[in-house]
Amino acid sequence: GSGIFQLRLQEFVNQRGMLANGQSCEPGCRTFFRICLKHFQATFSEGPCTFGNVSTPVLGTNSFVVRDKNSGSGRNPLQLPFNFTWPGTFSLNIQAWHTPGDDLRPETSPGNSLISQIIIQGSLAVGKIWRTDEQNDTLTRLSYSYRVICSDNYYGESCSRLCKKRDDHFGHYECQPDGSLSCLPGWTGKYCDQPICLSGCHEQNGYCSKPDECICRPGWQGRLCNECIPHNGCRHGTCSIPWQCACDEGWGGLFCDQDLNYCTHHSPCKNGSTCSNSGPKGYTCTCLPGYTGEHCELGLSKCASNPCRNGGSCKDQENSYHCLCPPGYYGQHCEHSTLTCADSPCFNGGSCRERNQGSSYACECPPNFTGSNCEKKVDRCTSNPCANGGQCQNRGPSRTCRCRPGFTGTHCELHISDCARSPCAHGGTCHDLENGPVCTCPAGFSGRRCEVRITHDACASGPCFNGATCYTGLSPNNFVCNCPYGFVGSRCEFPVGLPPSFPWVA
């Protein structure tokens, strides 16, 4: 502890100029004071001034008022500093002396004589308020006041608590009257060394080094560090924990980059045709009559359906067609005949049958021939039966569809996955991606098709933690860790839901 006992001398009265022994001072009592402060004694005794002692220069002659003086010789109030815990009790002896000698250092002069003395014993609490008193004896009167205050940076009832205000990285505080710390705005903790982060900053996922700041730990982002960072390369997905990639509706694959709903996202089918999804990036367009092509983008000729019968020739017009009928036929589609079986109208061995009492006829055609007069060889490709750009080929009485790469089925209506051809060598796992198949290679292989045997296996060093599976050939780092439930991070090194003190910073 550390404090100061302060004694303010106010007035001394010795009207007759007398000494304690009854003699008078000549020409007057040149008065100085000796003060002795010690521990409390029920009966004051001589002995060391255990709490300190002090002497004044000559302050006046006989009777005088003592003015306050802050420095130099004759300082008033008198200061009695102590370096211990103030006990709350004391004994004080104030002696008035006459000196015939030096004004400034009367203590050293021979022939000094006691004028009077007073003894005060009692309790005194630390505080700024002065206690005022007056002591009289037969010859003299002394008015004075006193108090105990703590030295700078000492606080409390006994001046025992040391506290120094500071504003550095070991504390940001001021001192309360009892010596306890009062944190500066924005700081908290026992020593006021912990900043108060931005309001709402996530307790586990964010931290700060100065007030109103929110710095995110790895895997988190946003103003309050409450948004997780999805897996690097995650295209159409979100996360609920860091490094996750949970696909949005209609997307699939490790990075949610495989379109499972191409029809909705891209509307590839034209001219009112119907679109059907068929796997990642796969779709089929079903055309309305009068349209063809993979996306039904090609309009058919109005004559394409061969509307003219009985050998009539079809001519396209702006919004319709016109049939030019051969001799013996008439009508919009040359459907009416002026011929009879007598005119032998059936070609290619067709049999003629009379109708309407011989006023018209019908031909029954042999195999591979058609038309009102069996005049046409059957073409099984005219109905465009091959989907997805397949080529139709007549094969005698039947026809076949020759499909484009990636399609199969009688009418090329089925989409083949790029992975169906098993393009990945050495047991690699195939993923259908937008730009073709991508292979996830087993340990020891790399390359687009896992065809390259690698001498340095990026997974060999066991970079994945917590039982995660390591894959090579998927990323620029040559490996990707597939985390088990409950772990996150590029190496699955972070457990989900860490305690606040977890050391995230690497």
Epitope: D152, L162, D168, H169, F170, G189, Q194, S501
Partner: antibody, heavy 121, light 106 residues
Framework: EVQLQESGPGLVKPSETLSLTCTVS??????????WGWIRQPPGKGLEWIGD???????YYNPSLKSRVTISVDTSKNQFSLKLSSVTAADTAVYYC?????????????WGQGTLVTVSS | SYELTQPPSVSVSPGQTASITCSGQ??????ASWYQQKPGQSPVLVIY???KRPSGIPERFSGSNSGDTATLTISGTQPMDEADYYC?????????FGYGTKVTVL
């Protein structure tokens, strides 16, 4: 009982970068009660504070060295490091790592044994 | 920049009291620490926060700090106390050491 151990090359060429690492054992570098610092002492001379760091990465540097000093922390390895660039012969010293305790008003109650780094070509 | 000034050397007879001063502008408003360093060894904290002793430091080491001066006092000095002594304080966020005082036990 916490222990600190400095490591790094004992000889560095002028104009190059001095790099030292302090490994902490027997306690966590991630404790909120401590800062971790570097102090140096040229041969036959007094101590000079270089800087210190908190486990979150907050750093404090001696203004006279600030332009050349970088202190970093690796909580996963329980280590912190010092880099001093563009060294000259005046940077020859014994380099100490130390722990500063907030509860001791920022006094350093644990020191490494020190490592002598000589700057010479 | 903030400076702490110490006398280069102090001599003391065994059993006597050695006082080492450390001066700096308004040093009494900062906390002073004292470190003892013997030849070839790392410094050891002997006083922190002006006058507090860490565990294991003998009672003969004491400290005070007021005004512009901090003082380390070694009462009943022993030959084993012969060492260099450094005062240290923080000026805002910067650590400052005194120049050091060599204590010789005669």
């Amino acid at each position: 009982e916490v222990q600190l151990q400095e490591s790094g090359p004992g000889l560095v060429k002028p104009s190059e970068t001095l790099s030292l690492t302090c490994t902490v054992s027997g306690g966590s570098i991630s404790s909120s009660s401590y800062y971790w610092g570097w102090i140096r002492q040229p041969p036959g001379k007094g101590l000079e504070w270089i800087g210190d760091i908190y486990y979150t990465g907050s750093t404090y540097y001696n203004p006279s060295l600030k332009s050349r000093v970088t202190i970093s922390v690796d909580t996963s390895k329980n280590q912190f490091s010092l880099k001093l660039s563009s060294v000259t012969a005046a940077d020859t010293a014994v380099y100490y790592c130390a722990r500063y305790d907030v509860s001791l008003g920022g006094s350093s109650d644990h020191w490494g044994q020190g490592t002598l780094v000589t700057v010479s070509s | 920049s903030y400076e702490l000034t110490q006398p280069p050397s102090v001599s003391v007879s065994p059993g006597q009291t050695a006082s080492i001063t450390c001066s700096g502008q308004r040093l009494g408003d900062k906390y002073a620490s004292w470190y003892q360093q013997k030849p070839g060894q790392s410094p050891v904290l002997v006083i922190y926060e002006d006058s507090k002793r860490p565990s294991g430091i003998p009672e003969r080491f004491s400290g005070s700090n007021s005004g512009d001066t901090a003082t380390l006092t070694i009462s009943g000095t022993q030959p084993m106390d012969e060492a260099d002594y450094y005062c240290q304080a923080w000026d805002r966020d910067t650590g400052v050491f005194g120049y050091g005082t060599k204590v010789t036990v005669l």
